[in-house]
């Protein structure tokens, strides 16, 4: 059976995925290639918005936001004026750590 993960080994915590008459590895963050044996750059997918710079840390990715943006992925504009707007904050992951 071609569509079978039983004999397929995926390295570095990757998981075998069946489908379309074939099987492949779905790799953990930071790994790639057919069997997840190659180092991959998780920042290559450009996970930060609005020109934020991506950095890979041991605990996960981090975005350093361009001036005027905030949020874990720099998704929110910072608007110091207006009641309905976001509070002013320095660039980066401010304000606060959103993890709960």
């Amino acid at each position: 059976d071609l569509d079978d993960c039983a004999g397929r080994a995926c390295a570095n915590g990757g998981t075998c995925v069946e489908g379309g008459g074939a099987h492949r590895c779905s790799c953990a963050l930071g790994f790639g290639g057919r069997d997840c044996r190659e180092r991959a750059d998780p920042c290559a997918a450009r996970p930060c918005a609005h020109g934020g710079r991506c950095y890979a840390h041991f605990s996960g990715l981090v975005c350093a936001c361009a001036p005027g943006y905030m949020g874990a992925r720099c998704e929110f504009p910072v608007h110091p004026d207006g009641a309905s707007a976001l509070p002013a904050a320095p660039p980066g992951l401010r304000p606060g750590d959103p993890q709960r």
Partner: antibody, heavy 124, light 113 residues
Framework: QEQLVESGGGLVQPGGSLKLSCKVS????????VSWVRQAPGKGLEWIGY????????YYASWVNGRFTISSHNAQNTLYLQLNSLTAADTATYFC?????????????????WGPGTLVTVSS | DVVMTQTPASVEAAVGGTVTINCQAS??????LSWYQQKPGQPPKLLIY???TLASGVPSRFKGSGSGTQFTLTISDLECADAATYYC???????????????FGGGTEVVVK
């Protein structure tokens, strides 16, 4: 092909707990997160929370109040929703949903791939 | 928390007609507004994200517009297959907890005659 499949639903007594699973495949967590959304019978959609595995972050709706916990395991291909202190008001279909967060530098924050859902019934 | 108010709760229109659904956010959500279609017994389906961008495979009869706090979904040239419940969804900055959160509108049932 992108896919999410929930499991673990069923009948549970008031005050009880349940752990739902979501098996995901076919996409890269650099750009996507996974959200849990529920829908009571005949009612609208209610967001519970989401996990952004690449950033190691978990976010919850304010009403969750610590009763529910989202986690991931096994190279981030299986996600979980732990439900505690359940009441009849928690009876719903629970959906596991892919969230397009930031793709190629563009922020989307739309829920683009939905699982079929798993029904949780809280009753004595 | 942001409250998404969807109007009307129900709307009826003839085949070939046009339906407009409104969604109002209680605070500025910028362009982070998505629309979903749900038919009985099925999970919702993404129609539009970022206010006006059509999801893959969605016909151009569906049009999203708006910004800030006021948003609209317009369905033109109505077909029987458009009979469904439609939901708006926002992504917003939650100042109380300092992170992003999602919220859904209450839904609009579209009946096609």
């Amino acid at each position: 092909q992108e896919q999410l499949v929930e499991s673990g639903g069923g009948l549970v007594q008031p005050g009880g707990s349940l752990k739902l699973s979501c098996k995901v495949s076919g996409f890269d967590f650099s750009n996507y997160g996974v959200s849990w959304v529920r829908q009571a019978p005949g009612k609208g959609l209610e967001w519970i929370g989401y996990i952004d595995p690449a950033f190691g972050r978990t976010y919850y709706a304010s009403w969750v109040n610590g009763r529910f916990t989202i986690s991931s395991h096994n190279a981030q291909n299986t996600l979980y929703l732990q439900l505690n202190s359940l009441t009849a008001a928690d009876t719903a279909t629970y959906f596991c949903v892919r969230v397009a967060l930031v793709v190629a530098g563009v922020a989307y924050y739309g829920m683009d791939v939905w699982g079929p859902g798993t029904l949780v019934t809280v009753s004595s | 928390d942001v409250v998404m108010t969807q109007t009307p709760a129900s709307v009826e229109a003839a085949v070939g007609g046009t339906v407009t659904i409104n969604c109002q956010a209680s605070q500025n959500i910028y362009s982070y507004l998505s629309w979903y279609q749900q038919k009985p017994g099925q999970p919702p389906k993404l129609l539009i994200y970022r206010t006006s961008t059509l999801a893959s495979g969605v016909p151009s009869r569906f049009k999203g517009s708006g910004s800030g706090t006021q948003f609209t979904l317009t369905i033109s040239d109505l077909e029987c297959a458009d009979a469904a419940t439609y939901y708006c969804q926002s992504y917003y900055y939650s100042s109380g907890s300092s992170y992003g959160a999602f919220a859904f509108g209450g839904g609009t049932e579209v009946v096609v005659k």
